[in-house]
Amino acid sequence: TPEVWVQVQMEATELSSFTVHCGFLGPGSISLVTVSWGGPDGAGGTKLAVLHPELGTRQWAPARQARWETQSSISLALEDSGASSPFANTTFCCKFASFPEGSWESCGSLPPSSDPGLSAPPTPVPILRADLAGILGLSGVLLFGCGYLLHLLRRQKHRPTPRLQPSHTNSQALTAQAWAPSQASQAALHDPYATINTSFCPATLDTAHPNGWASLPTHAAHQPQGPAASASTPILARGSFVSVENGLYTQAGERPPHTGPGLTLFPDCRGPRAVEGRFGVR
């Protein structure tokens, strides 16, 4: 069965910044992603962002930037302006929908521990200590190496015997590895794809067909859901209609990359009125 994973991270550089990562594991096509906090969609949650695979993104404060990471995962950056850091104890929920098959939702929060395998640490202390340990360790190795080299040089000076050729030190052997949280839970996902700016003229889409129809992605979703289940989806990605008059969607946001077979979206691209056939017609 399809699964949704949620990962909340505190940014190491800006302690007031949080990032919510959500992904969908399953077959099918995602039509809409809704991110909320304080509870799931329809159960007391407050919406933070809505991401549509073709129309872009919408977000509400304190969301700073919502974007697609892959065709089946998204990230949402949050700016915590309050001194009390309410995000630390908040539940974040992500709902992945495919119309009309169904929708799947999961929630998560910032882990209380600073396990690097799960999330960035909730406080700066572990990062500072790690950095300090790295710096001290590297300094120690360098000092020890220098002292050892000086010791060797001294010994060679005092020896009348032929000098030994000093071995070349591999400068890359002493590399400091920066600490970074591992994303173990994302191992099963696709590699990130390039982000494509929103544009609704098929000529600008990388999957536009010669006859003027544009393909939409049908990647990453799920199996049909029972008749009693409610679901979510976008109208466009499923053959709905849209008006692109006055460049309404030109700044809609980022979209996941277009790969694989798609669904038809635009019948033509000859001008402002040419795309009004499927939805949103005035």
Epitope: S36, F99, S232, S243
Partner: nanobody, 120 residues
Framework: EVQLVESGGGLVQPGGSLRLSCAAS????????MGWFRQAPGKGLEGVAH???????RYVESVKGRFTISRDNAKNSLYLQMNSLRAEDTAVYYC??????????????WGQGTMVTVSS
Amino acid sequence: EVQLVESGGGLVQPGGSLRLSCAASGFTFSTDCMGWFRQAPGKGLEGVAHIDSDGIPRYVESVKGRFTISRDNAKNSLYLQMNSLRAEDTAVYYCVVGFKFGDYCAPNDWGQGTMVTVSS
């Protein structure tokens, strides 16, 4: 939990009329729009009409002048009056609520659908 329940579908002769209803409950999100989608047998989904929070209805070209969308906020209900029905209107009709992207209503939730069959 958000629930959308459609009713009013059935068999009708070409040129006839039907009125679809959708009862909505369980909303906590402030969605921007409500609308109707349809899926004809063996075909993809198509948006039929939607109505924004500003009350302005929008229709797909093929139903303009024949279908009328309306909502009753007091009853949390959405309606689709379908007149002059054609064989090509045969489809499962879904009631949706969603978010606006420009003039476009992207569904966030929908019902199980009601079948409309136009045949003589």
